[in-house]
Interface confidence: low
């Protein structure tokens, strides 16, 4: 399981007249459910239950976004509509270029994502936990426009980073 280097850029326009970018670097792991590839896109937060909806007319986004899903404690969803892997597949079917799972509340999901699938997704499926997950969800919960850049190596030079 390789380390996924995730750079999240929160991007907003302030009334004072400046674009403000906040960059947060965090690490996760590429799971065996997906490919070990770089990916980049606008973050779309998805509720785990939102991925249950089978109506393809709903919750469709333009291609190229990064889905972020905070998994609930298993006790809160004893009979999930889809496995974690199924949720990742559903997100990719809807146009996600990558999926990031916060597994802090559901560490069992790590094993589910790493069970060697015969047909892994062609897009990266990353999981984060602990402090990295807290940082990620803190940004996502701001409901601002944000981008995630996922790499399978650390950014090579400072110029690859957005300014803090």
């Amino acid at each position: 399981k390789e380390t996924a280097f995730v750079e999240v850029v929160l991007f907003e326009s302030s009334p004072s007249g400046d674009y403000t970018t906040y960059t947060t670097g965090l690490t996760g792991r590429f799971s065996r459910a997906g490919a070990t590839l770089s990916a980049e896109g606008e973050i779309v937060q998805m509720h785990p239950l939102g991925l249950c909806n089978n109506n393809d007319e709903e919750d469709l986004y333009e291609y190229g976004w990064v889905g972020v899903v905070k998994l609930e404690q298993p006790e809160l969803d004893p009979k999930p509509c889809l496995t974690v892997l199924g949720k990742a597949k559903r997100a990719v079917q809807r146009g996600a270029t990558a999926v990031i799972f916060d597994v802090s509340e559901n560490p069992e999901a790590i094993d589910q994502l790493n069970q060697g699938s015969e047909d892994p997704l062609k897009r990266p499926v990353v999981y984060v936990k602990g402090a990295d997950a807290i940082k990620l969800m803190n940004i996502v919960n701001k409901q601002k426009v944000a981008r995630a850049r996922i790499q399978h190596r650390p950014p090579r030079q400072p110029t690859e980073y957005f300014d803090m």
């Epitope: 850029v9 991007f11 907003e12 326009s13 302030s14 009334p15 007249g17 400046d18 674009y19 980049e40 606008e42 333009e62 409901q143 426009v145 944000a146 981008r147 110029t159 690859e160 980073y161 957005f162 300014d163």
Partner: antibody, heavy 117, light 107 residues
Framework: QVQLVQSGAEVKKPGASVKVSCKAS????????MHWVRQAPGQGLEWMGI????????SYAQKFQGRVTMTRDTSTSTVYMELSSLRSEDTAVYYC??????????WGQGTLVTVSS | DIQMTQSPSSLSASVGDRVTITCRAS??????LAWYQQKPGKAPKLLIY???SLQRGVPSRFSGSGSGTDFTLTISSLQPEDFATYYC?????????FGGGTKVEIK
């Protein structure tokens, strides 16, 4: 598909105001800030400002501060740009354009505003 | 304000030529740079964002590179529909600013 449809051409006298509308469809209106960019005849592109449809916050270019007002109506997914104290050099095509993390990915068809006495 | 200087201001080229347009920012803008194509009487069209990312639906003959202050738009093999004016634009800080444009004409 994403569409930004602007109001029709306007002819105004110097000193008057003009209000251009831009109706968005095909995406979640609140999720994407909207820019206004203008282009004088035969000239380049000039950024005027941006509005965040979610909260209504705005950011204007210094050049237009005090003369431009950008508003939005979330019930109709429409943004508005009003420019006051018009002068002949404000004659231009005015575009609304959707922001997607720094780039402007969709543009309206443009509204020609002519300022002439 | 960040000044964006584009060069050349115009160029003549033939179908099949490789065309390169450069854009220089007056200060570092990381990769907050986009390239647009505009044809007479039409709205600009996004080609490249984040300096090097190709917008969906744009032909792969268009490519962008650069970071910091110096950026390049390359058209690998010019097609008849590519004759237009091209603009770079920074979104690192407000006010957003555009380059003066490069008009690509038929030789």
């Amino acid at each position: 598909q994403v569409q930004l449809v602007q109001s029709g051409a306007e002819v105004k006298k110097p000193g008057a105001s003009v209000k251009v509308s831009c109706k968005a469809s095909g995406y979640t209106f609140r999720r994407y800030p909207m820019h206004w960019v203008r282009q004088a005849p035969g000239q380049g592109l000039e950024w005027m400002g941006i509005i965040n449809p979610s909260g209504g916050s705005t950011s204007y270019a210094q050049k237009f501060q005090g003369r431009v007002t950008m508003t939005r109506d979330t019930s109709t997914s429409t943004v508005y740009m009003e420019l006051s104290s018009l002068r002949s050099e404000d004659t231009a095509v005015y575009y609304c354009a959707r922001d997607k993390v720094g780039a402007i990915d969709y543009w309206g068809q443009g509204t020609l505003v002519t300022v002439s006495s | 304000d960040i000044q964006m200087t584009q060069s050349p201001s115009s160029l003549s080229a033939s179908v099949g030529d490789r065309v390169t347009i450069t854009c220089r920012a007056s200060q570092g803008i990381s990769n907050y740079l986009a390239w647009y194509q505009q044809k007479p009487g039409k709205a600009p069209k996004l080609l490249i964002y984040a300096a090097s990312s190709l917008q969906r639906g744009v032909p792969s003959r268009f490519s962008g590179s650069g970071s910091g202050t110096d950026f390049t738009l390359t058209i690998s093999s010019l097609q008849p529909e590519d004759f237009a004016t091209y603009y770079c634009q920074q979104s690192y800080s407000t006010p957003l600013t555009f380059g003066g444009g490069t008009k690509v004409e038929i030789k």
